[in-house]
């Protein structure tokens, strides 16, 4: 029986050009975490294997950094990064637990301010 629950950072927002940490935490189970996959829609961002460490998918290597912990850091954010992110915990013997985070990337306030008050 799967007793665990995943806590996530929930709905979060960040500024364009900035970075954000995606975090999930599995609790209420004694199951062994063998691997955590980080995903966005049908894309695999990264895998953290308990024995082998981190693998960042080549498409994201320049913008994704492992950690802290089992979390994932997204860098140089663009508005196209807005959307759902999933942490998939592969555990033994429980099976798979999934957490969801919604990220909204906003135009930076500096950019907005600059656009409104341009000097002619």
């Amino acid at each position: 029986m799967m007793t665990g629950t995943i806590e996530t950072t929930g709905n979060i927002s960040a500024e364009k050009g900035g970075s954000i940490i995606l975090q999930c935490h599995l609790s209420s189970t004694t199951a062994q975490v063998t691997q955590v996959n980080w995903e966005q829609q049908d894309q695999l961002l990264a895998i953290c294997n308990a024995d082998l460490g981190w693998h960042i998918s080549p498409s994201f290597k320049d913008r994704v950094a492992p950690g802290p912990g089992l979390g994932l850091t997204l860098q140089s954010l663009t508005v196209n990064d807005t959307g759902e992110y999933f942490c998939i915990y592969h555990t033994y013997p429980d099976g798979t637990y999934t957490g969801r985070i919604f990220l909204e990337v906003l135009e930076s306030s500096v950019a907005e301010h600059g656009a409104r008050f341009q000097i002619p």
Epitope: I47, D51, G53
Partner: antibody, heavy 120, light 107 residues
């Protein structure tokens, strides 16, 4: 360049223990992941398990009760032990390296393979 | 376990032809797929990882595509030396599993 070489008996009797060794040159087994994969007659490949850079092991659950992977870092060798073999274990056994950080679970270096027949 | 199905176990082609080998995963594996080439009497060689990335030294006539459950390995212009068995593999989760292989015959 990384080179792997399997060695061990080509013939085993049912119920015996199969022991194979893999000698690695050009790279230290204290980095990356060191794996055993077998190919059955008729081409089917089966992933058997690994020993990691730190000495942690993973075994395919289909073999878990029969398999052991160990290493000797002073000799830069790792080993496969498969207990209670049957004719179904007749296969070509490959040792292989996996660079998880760069390629995930894709195996980038393979030994040439050693053929094992289980027969009474 | 995730099952990787290569429905065409045998494919016949001619030098210069374009050939595609398909692989279907029993569940969504995103892009965690590799392709290998095994020539007669040799060990497998890594060709593609992360569904579409060519491994070091692999000629650009070999390409990989797909995500989710459906994957394709394409040789744009088959050469005589491409005679081999081609395998897909998923590494989305352990145990990592392979397809049954597709044998490419050159006419």
């Amino acid at each position: 360049e990384v080179q792997l070489q399997e060695s061990g008996p080509g013939l085993a009797k049912p119920s015996q223990t199969l022991s194979l060794a893999c000698s690695v040159t050009g790279y230290s087994i204290t980095s990356d992941s060191w794996n055993w994969i077998r190919k059955f007659p008729g081409n089917k490949l089966e992933y058997m398990g690994y020993i990691s850079y730190s000495g942690n092991t993973y075994y395919n659950p289909s073999l878990k009760s029969r398999i052991s992977i160990t290493r000797d870092t002073s000799k830069n060798q790792f080993y496969l032990q498969l207990n209670s073999v049957t004719t179904e274990d007749t296969a070509t056994y490959y040792c292989a390296r996996l660079d998880f950080s760069n390629y995930g679970g894709a195996v980038d270096y393979w030994g040439q393979g050693t053929s094992v027949t289980v027969s009474s | 376990d995730i099952v990787m199905t290569q429905s065409h176990t045998f494919m016949s082609t001619s030098v210069g032809d374009r050939v595609s080998i398909t692989c279907k995963a029993s569940q969504n594996v995103r892009t965690a797929v590799a392709w290998y080439q095994q020539k007669p009497g040799q060990s497998p060689k890594l060709m593609i990882y992360s569904a579409s990335y060519r491994y070091t030294g692999v000629p650009d006539r070999f390409t990989g595509s797909g995500s989710g459950t459906d994957f394709t390995f394409t040789i744009s212009s088959v050469q005589a030396e491409d005679l081999a068995v081609y395998y897909c593999q998923q590494y989305y989760t352990t145990p990592w599993t392979f397809g049954g292989g597709a044998k490419l015959e050159i006419q």
